[in-house]
C-alpha cells in the first residue's frame, strides 16, 4: 500500500488556500473529482466535486470552495477562500472511479487557519474594491453520497449515484476573493 | 533529510548543448513537481522550467522554450534539463528545486550547477 | 505574466535595527507570494509563505504581511547572519512562476 503522507500548510483567517493536485491525464483526464475533509475517526466527507464527467477547466464553486479541472494539464485546481479557523484539518484531492474505489491525489494537506489577517491597509482579499465575483454560471456539482475510509486499501463507495445531501457540502456565503484563471503558455 | 545535487554544469560554446542532473533523496519524488531555476552572475533568480507529479506536465519560461527540455526518471529519483541551441545570456547558476505543499513555491532548493556559455 | 516589483534595490541597516521590504504585483496574487532568502555562493532559502507564514526553522524575527498587491518583509531586528538578498516570488498565476528582482539588505 502507498504511505500515506501529509503537507501542513499554515494560513491566516480571510487568507485563500490554493493548491494543486496532480492526476494521470490518460487515465483520469474527464473523471469526476473531489475535495475532501479527513476528521480524527470519522471516513473522508466530500466538500465539493467537479461534474461527471468532470468539464475543462470549467469552474466549480461549493460555498468558499472551487475547483477547476485543467485536463490537458493534469492538474486539479483547489481554491478554499476566505478561510476561517474552523477550517482548520486534513484535506485530500481524489477522483472517484466507481465501481473501484477513489483514488487519493497528491499528498494529503494539514491546513492550519490561525486567527489574525496578514493584509495590509487596502488590500485585504475580502475587501469589495476592485473585487472579480465568481460568476452566477459557475456549476455546483452533485457528489457522490458516499466517501470511502480513509485507508489505501479502500472499499468501494456504497453509492455511486449522483445525489446531494445538505451534510456534504459547506453552505458559506460572502465569497469575495478575487478569482483569476490561470493562463497557460 | 532532503536532498537536491545538481550536475552536468560546464563552459560550451553558442549553439552548444548540455545536459543537467539532479539526483534527490528524502521525499518521493514522483509526486512532486520539480522545477529549475537559474541566477545569471550577479542577477536575480529567473524560473526556467518545471515538470509535475503525477501528471508530467511540463512548462517552460518563454526564454527557453524549445530550445530546452525538462524530465525525469522517477526510477532513478533524477530530474533532467536538456538544454540545446544554447546562447551567452544562458550562462547562470542552475538550481534545482523542490515545489512545497502542492503549491509552485521551492523549500529545498540543489546547490546549483554553473553553466557558461561562451565562445 | 505578473511582474513582481522590490524596493528599494538595497537596503542599508545597521545590526539590532529594523529592516522593511516591499513587493508589488502587477496584479492581484491574493496571499500566494513567498520570500526567499539568498547568502553569497549559497542557493535561496525559502523564509515565508501564504504572504505571512514562516516557513519551518524561521526565527521569530521575520515576519510577512500584505495580500493582493502590495506585501512587506520585515526583520524586526537585524542579525549579522540576516545580511543577504531577499526575493519576493508570486505563485498565483502559472507558469511562470516569477520573481522580484531582489533586496539587498547590507551592514549600514
Known amino acids: 500500500a502507498t504511505k500515506l503522507t501529509e503537507e501542513k500548510y499554515e494560513l491566516k483567517e480571510g487568507q485563500t488556500l490554493d493548491v494543486k493536485c496532480d492526476y494521470t491525464l490518460e487515465k483520469f483526464a474527464s473523471s469526476q473529482k473531489a475535495w475532501q475533509i479527513i476528521r480524527d475517526g470519522e471516513m473522508p466527507k466530500t466538500l465539493a466535486c467537479t461534474e461527471r464527467p468532470s468539464k475543462n477547466s470549467h469552474p466549480v464553486q461549493v460555498g468558499r470552495i472551487i475547483l477547476e479541472d485543467y485536463h490537458d494539464h493534469g492538474l486539479l485546481r483547489v481554491r478554499m477562500v476566505n478561510l476561517q479557523v474552523e477550517d482548520s484539518g486534513l484535506y485530500q484531492c481524489v477522483i472517484y472511479q466507481p465501481p473501484k474505489e477513489p483514488h487519493m491525489l497528491f499528498d494529503r494537506i494539514r491546513l492550519v487557519v490561525t486567527k489574525g489577517f496578514s493584509g495590509t491597509p487596502g488590500s485585504n482579499e475580502n475587501s469589495t474594491q476592485n473585487v472579480y465575483k465568481i460568476p452566477p454560471t459557475t456549476t455546483k456539482a452533485l457528489c457522490p453520497l458516499y466517501t470511502s475510509p480513509r485507508t489505501v486499501t479502500q472499499a468501494p463507495p456504497k453509492s455511486t449515484a449522483d445525489v446531494s445531501t445538505p451534510d456534504s457540502e459547506i453552505n458559506l456565503t460572502n465569497v469575495t476573493d478575487i478569482i483569476r484563471v490561470p493562463v497557460f503558455n | 533529510e532532503v536532498q537536491l545535487l545538481e550536475s552536468g554544469g560546464g563552459m560550451v560554446q553558442p549553439g552548444g548543448s548540455l545536459r543537467l542532473s539532479c539526483a534527490v533523496s528524502?521525499?518521493?519524488?514522483?509526486?512532486?513537481?520539480m522545477s529549475w531555476v537559474r541566477q545569471a552572475p550577479g542577477k536575480g533568480l529567473e524560473w526556467v522550467s518545471e515538470?509535475?507529479?503525477?501528471?508530467?506536465?511540463?512548462y517552460y519560461a518563454d526564454s527557453v522554450k524549445g530550445r530546452f527540455t525538462i524530465s525525469r526518471d522517477n526510477s532513478k529519483n533524477t530530474l533532467y534539463l536538456q538544454m540545446n541551441s544554447l546562447r551567452v545570456e544562458d550562462t547562470a547558476i542552475y538550481y534545482c528545486a523542490k515545489e512545497f505543499s502542492s503549491n509552485s513555491l521551492f523549500d529545498y532548493w540543489g546547490q546549483g550547477t554553473l553553466v557558461t556559455v561562451s565562445s | 505574466e505578473i511582474v513582481m516589483t522590490q524596493s528599494p534595490a538595497t537596503l542599508s541597516v545597521s545590526p539590532g535595527e529594523r529592516a522593511t521590504l516591499s513587493c508589488r504585483a502587477s496584479q492581484s496574487v491574493n496571499s500566494n507570494l513567498a520570500w526567499y532568502q539568498q547568502k553569497p555562493g549559497q542557493a535561496p532559502r525559502l523564509l515565508i509563505y501564504g504572504a505571512s507564514t514562516r516557513a519551518t526553522g524561521i526565527p521569530a524575527r521575520f515576519s510577512g504581511s500584505g495580500s493582493g498587491t502590495e506585501f512587506t518583509l520585515t526583520i524586526s531586528s537585524l542579525q549579522s547572519e540576516d545580511f543577504a538578498v531577499y526575493y519576493c516570488?508570486?505563485?498565483?498565476?502559472?507558469?511562470?512562476?516569477?520573481f522580484g528582482q531582489g533586496t539587498k539588505v547590507e551592514i549600514k
Open positions: 515538470m509535475r507529479g503525477s501528471s508530467g506536465s511540463t
Open positions: 528524502g521525499f518521493t519524488f514522483s509526486r512532486y513537481a
Open positions: 516570488q508570486q505563485f498565483y498565476n502559472w507558469p511562470p512562476y516569477t
